[in-house]
Structures are given as structure tokens and as C-alpha cells.
Interface confidence: medium
């Protein structure tokens, strides 16, 4: 048993242009509630019920209201801390649901106005006892910072809160630093300390000394984030000696995808294509209406207002899934011509083309000859991009400056001499032997 | 089809209580929202209590805090209403809705009909002095 703690740092307007000022209008004074709900990682739960690990409620913020062209202040945040108390076991990896909900007062009849303002949801890997994570989440123009941790309630202790330690009546039989622990009088538990310098955002430890890694961390002591990791192979477990990634099972066996998604293999990881009301890292969130805010990257979201209408993501250019999850490989569909390389730059699409093609898909063959002049009366054949110089005898080269020695490639057969001569080559052949080449 | 069906009503003296009941049937998925509401003869309906589908959101008329209380069991799709200390100005027919707010960041109001898109037929409740 034990209890998850949620601590809401901040809540507002994100970076960015078009962040919205405030959460409240100049109209009306309003408050900030937050809820959490949290599941185990690997929970395949439906919404019915979502929060297989419980939910909290924050009290109501303080009231605020918006002064037309004062600086927009920090918002009054609920006192105390969202409090998720767990009865078993603590999973290790847990999903949650934070939302920011406003409530509107002043226009007393028929009660206030709700409205669900933010929703974030992740995955996370947690041991219970460390110390405060912190987070950083973004949805949509908002931007909400937190920190959490999950601590268990005596006489539980341990990473999972499932051993229990029951102070004895003779402590001092433990030395200085160490309690006794049941069910043996004589075992003395040290208190949990990760190895030195054990990164307290991205690692923690279930065995003293060690640094296991969140996530998405690498390295001895988790400070090193994965996608700038210089090693060569893209899966398994971190290893400790050299913080690189070591060979191990692939990201999709066993399929992490909850809900019926299906698992495909990315070069450092996996990506679940979720079902229809379904979305996060491992399809683990439920959301079958709007106000769920499922659609992700700017979607538009139409319908399902109602239980048994699904929603509908309208995503914006360049997205694509049932929730705009997924960034639209614009590069795939070949859209740039004449082998031009296709860089797709997210705001844009852009072709870089090869020499001698031209245009926003390079699809303007460029005359290879204009302005290119070939010496010593060679001529410019155009083609593949690039031009090109059909040399007049005794001269080679790109642009036929050079000149050429036409017996340097001993054309005469058969034991034939070989005279350069102004207008080519002769070949003088060897008795028994005639042709311009002694061919014969 | 949505459907809902409140049961629990009847008669009861001042001071008395009743449990109301709302089971819904017709959809895998929970609504975000699910309210009582009640309409005593020729005033307009109002709203008494509403939660949330995680059984975390609650909220109350005026009228009634500290007397009723809104509860949910998820397993059995079925919403809750416990009327304790009923006075007769309770009396009214008493109707179960689903709903919830559209989209992020629309106003919605939990005490306001227009807020919920299904509806049951009522059960009566009549408290006597």
C-alpha cells in the first residue's frame, strides 16, 4: 500500500505564437481544477473503468480574473497535493491522465461552466520511495509542469511497497543508518541508495548502488537521452558499462500495444497503430469523445459528443492517424523528379535537384549546352543533367582542352604500329595484316 | 439505442429518504457526464447533482448539499442518486441524463439541461409534510 503524489508546478499559456493569454476571459472569474487518473502500464482497461490505480480531485484554485492589459500573472493554483492512494502492490510502469478543467462563476443560474482545458497523458517508469520526478507536458497552446512520486504508507517499503518493515522493540541491534525489517528480527534493511551521481529525473534503483534508466535515458547514470546515443544497435536493455544500448528482444515482441493496436518496428523503438478511440505511446489511453481531446498536433475533432458516435480527427497538412498522431512521410510519395532529393522540412516540402533540372519538384530540364562551350571545335551533347563534349579527333577532356594522344590506347592490332598524325592516327601493320586497325 | 432507466422513486414523509437508481444500457463506453435532474409541475427543470465518469467530479445544486449524494458503480453502468432529510419542496419527477462537454474548452454547464444529450423517462418522487 501506498500513496501517488502529484504536485502541479504550473499552468499556463505554452511558448510559442498564438498561446493563449489566459485560461480566464476578462469576462468572468474563474478557477483551475485539476484531475489525475492513473493505470498500470501495461493496462489493457476499457473506460469503463480507466483508472485501475485510482483518481484524484484537486480542491478548487483561487478565484481569478483577467484585468484587460495588465500582464498576464502566473495562475492561482490549487493548494496541496492530487493524493492517488494505492492498495496493492505499486506497478513499477503506470500510465496517467492529468487534465486542467476552468471554472467558470458569475453567472450564477443554473450553476457555473465547466470546461476541460487540458488533457496530457504519458507512460512512465517509477520506482516507489525515489525522489520527485519532474515533467514537462504540452497540449495543444497550453503548458503544464509537475512533479510526482509514489511513497509507501508503513509498514510497506520497498520499490513495489510489497515487503513490509515493522519497527522492533530493540532497534539498536542494526547499526547507524539501518531499521529492522520483518519477518526475520535479525535482518537489517540499509536505506535505498542509488549508485553516485544517479541522475534524480531520468533514473532510479530497486538495489543500492545500481542507476537503472527511465524511458527514453541511457548511460551509467541515465544522463544521456537516447536519441543521441552513438550506438550502433537500436534495441535492448542499457548497459551499464558503456551506456550503450545492448542487443536484446525486439521492441514489438510480446506487442506493448494495448487495446487491440498493432506493433510496428521503428529504428530506435516501435509505433502502435491504435484503434479508433484508443491513442497514447502503447494505445493505453481511452478516449471516445472530444472532450477527451484525442486529436493530437492541431486536429480538428467533429462528433462523438455522445458515447456511441465516434469522433473524428480532421488533421492539419502533414499528419495523418485516427488521432493526427503520426507525421506524414510527405518524402515517401516521390514527389521530386529527375532524381531530385526530397527534404521534407515539416512547414514545407523541398526537392533538391540534380545538376541540370530546375523547378519546385525539379521537373524543368535545364538546356545542359546554354552557355557551355567546348574547345578546339568540339561539339556539347546534352543529357543526364549534365553536358557533355564530343571532342574532335587529337583532343579529350571535359571541355576538349586537352590534347589527346590517339596511339595511348594502343588501337593498332595485331603487332601493328601506331603515328599520331594531325587529322588521327595510322597504323602501320606487321606483314600478313591490312585494315586501319590491322583488324584483318 | 441509448437508453436510460431511472427507478427508486415514491412517496415519503418530510424528513425521510430515498435511493434513486440510473442504469444505462446502449453504448460500450461511459458518457463523460451523468446528472440528475428534476421538474416539480409548472416550474422549469433543474438541475441536482452530476459525475463524472471516473467518479472523481461531483457537483451540487445548492438546494440539495449536504442532503443527497451522487454515486456511480462503473461494472454495473448504473449512476446513483441518495436523498437523505427529503423536504417537500423535493417533490417533482426526477430524470437521469448523460452528457458532457463537446470539445476542449467549450463551456458546458453540469447543472443546465442543455449540457446533456440523452435522456430517461423520470421516476416520481413525492415527499409529504
Known amino acids: 500500500a501506498g500513496v501517488f503524489e502529484l504536485q502541479i508546478h504550473s499552468f499556463g499559456p505554452g511558448p510559442g505564437p498564438g498561446a493563449p493569454r489566459s485560461p480566464c476571459s476578462a469576462r468572468l472569474p474563474c478557477r483551475l481544477f485539476f484531475r489525475v487518473c492513473l493505470k498500470p502500464g501495461l493496462s489493457e482497461e476499457a473506460a469503463e473503468s480507466p483508472c485501475a490505480l485510482g483518481a484524484a480531485l484537486s480542491a478548487r484554485g483561487p478565484v481569478y480574473t483577467e484585468q484587460p492589459g495588465a500582464p498576464a500573472p502566473d495562475l492561482p493554483l490549487p493548494d496541496g497535493l492530487l493524493q492517488v492512494p494505492f492498495r496493492d502492490a505499486w506497478p513499477g510502469t503506470f500510465s496517467f491522465i492529468i487534465e486542467t478543467w476552468r471554472e467558470e462563476l458569475g453567472d450564477q443560474i443554473g450553476g457555473p461552466a465547466w470546461s476541460l482545458l487540458a488533457r496530457v497523458a504519458g507512460r512512465r517508469r517509477l520506482a516507489a520511495g525515489g525522489p520527485w520526478a519532474r515533467d514537462i507536458q504540452r497540449a495543444g497552446a497550453w503548458e503544464l509542469r509537475f512533479s510526482y512520486r509514489a511513497r509507501c504508507e508503513p509498514p510497506a517499503v520497498g520499490t513495489a511497497c510489497t515487503r513490509l518493515c515493522r519497527p522492533r522493540s530493540a532497534p539498536s541491534r542494526c547499526g547507524p543508518g539501518l531499521r529492522p525489517c520483518a519477518p526475520l528480527e535479525d535482518e537489517c534493511e540499509a536505506p535505498l541508495v542509488c549508485r553516485a551521481g544517479c541522475s534524480p529525473e531520468h533514473g532510479f534503483c530497486e538495489q543500492p548502488g545500481e542507476c537503472r534508466c527511465l524511458e527514453g535515458w541511457t548511460g551509467p547514470l541515465c544522463t544521456v537521452p537516447v536519441s543521441t546515443s552513438s550506438c550502433l544497435s537500436p534495441r535492448g536493455p542499457s548497459s551499464a558499462t558503456t551506456g550503450c544500448l545492448v542487443p536484446g528482444p525486439g521492441p514489438c515482441d510480446g506487442n506493448p500495444c494495448a487495446n487491440g493496436g498493432s506493433c510496428s518496428e521503428t529504428p530506435r523503438s516501435f509505433e502502435c497503430t491504435c484503434p479508433r478511440g484508443f491513442y497514447g505511446l502503447r494505445c493505453e489511453v481511452s478516449g471516445v469523445t472530444c472532450a477527451d481531446g484525442p486529436c493530437f498536433n492541431g486536429g480538428l475533432c467533429v462528433g462523438g459528443a455522445d458515447p456511441d458516435s465516434a469522433y473524428i480527427c480532421h488533421c492539419p497538412p502533414g499528419f495523418q492517424g485516427s488521432n493526427c498522431e503520426k507525421r506524414v512521410d510527405r518524402c515517401s510519395l516521390q514527389p521530386c523528379r529527375n532524381g531530385g532529393l526530397c527534404l521534407d522540412l515539416g512547414h514545407a516540402l523541398r526537392c533538391r535537384c540534380r545538376a541540370g533540372f530546375a523547378g519546385p519538384r525539379c521537373e524543368h530540364d535545364l538546356d545542359d549546352c546554354a552557355g557551355r562551350a567546348c574547345a578546339n571545335g568540339g561539339t556539347c551533347v546534352e543529357g543526364g543533367g549534365a553536358h557533355r563534349c564530343s571532342c574532335a579527333l587529337g583532343f579529350g577532356g571535359r571541355d576538349c582542352r586537352e590534347r589527346a594522344d590517339p596511339c595511348a590506347a594502343r588501337p593498332c592490332a595485331h603487332g601493328g604500329r601506331c603515328y599520331a598524325h594531325f587529322s588521327g592516327l595510322v597504323c602501320a601493320c606487321a606483314p600478313g595484316y591490312m585494315g586501319a586497325r590491322c583488324e584483318f | 439505442e441509448v437508453q436510460l432507466a431511472e427507478s427508486g422513486g415514491g412517496s415519503v414523509q418530510a424528513g425521510g429518504s430515498l435511493r434513486l437508481s440510473c442504469a444505462a444500457s446502449g453504448y460500450t463506453y461511459r458518457s463523460n457526464f451523468m446528472g440528475w435532474f428534476r421538474q416539480a409541475p409548472a416550474k422549469e427543470r433543474e438541475g441536482v447533482a452530476t459525475i463524472d465518469s471516473r467518479g472523481t467530479i461531483t457537483y451540487y445544486a445548492d438546494s440539495v448539499k449536504g442532503r443527497f449524494t451522487i454515486s456511480q458503480d462503473n461494472e454495473k453502468n448504473t449512476v446513483y442518486l441518495q436523498m437523505n432529510s427529503l423536504k417537500p419542496e423535493d417533490t417533482a419527477m426526477y430524470y437521469c441524463?448523460?452528457?458532457?462537454?463537446?470539445?476542449?474548452?467549450?463551456?458546458?454547464?453540469?447543472?443546465?439541461?442543455?449540457?446533456?444529450?440523452?435522456w430517461g423517462q423520470g421516476t416520481q418522487v413525492t415527499v409529504s409534510s
Open positions: 441524463a448523460a452528457g458532457g462537454p463537446r470539445t476542449n474548452d467549450d463551456r458546458w454547464y453540469p447543472l443546465r439541461p442543455p449540457g446533456y444529450n440523452y
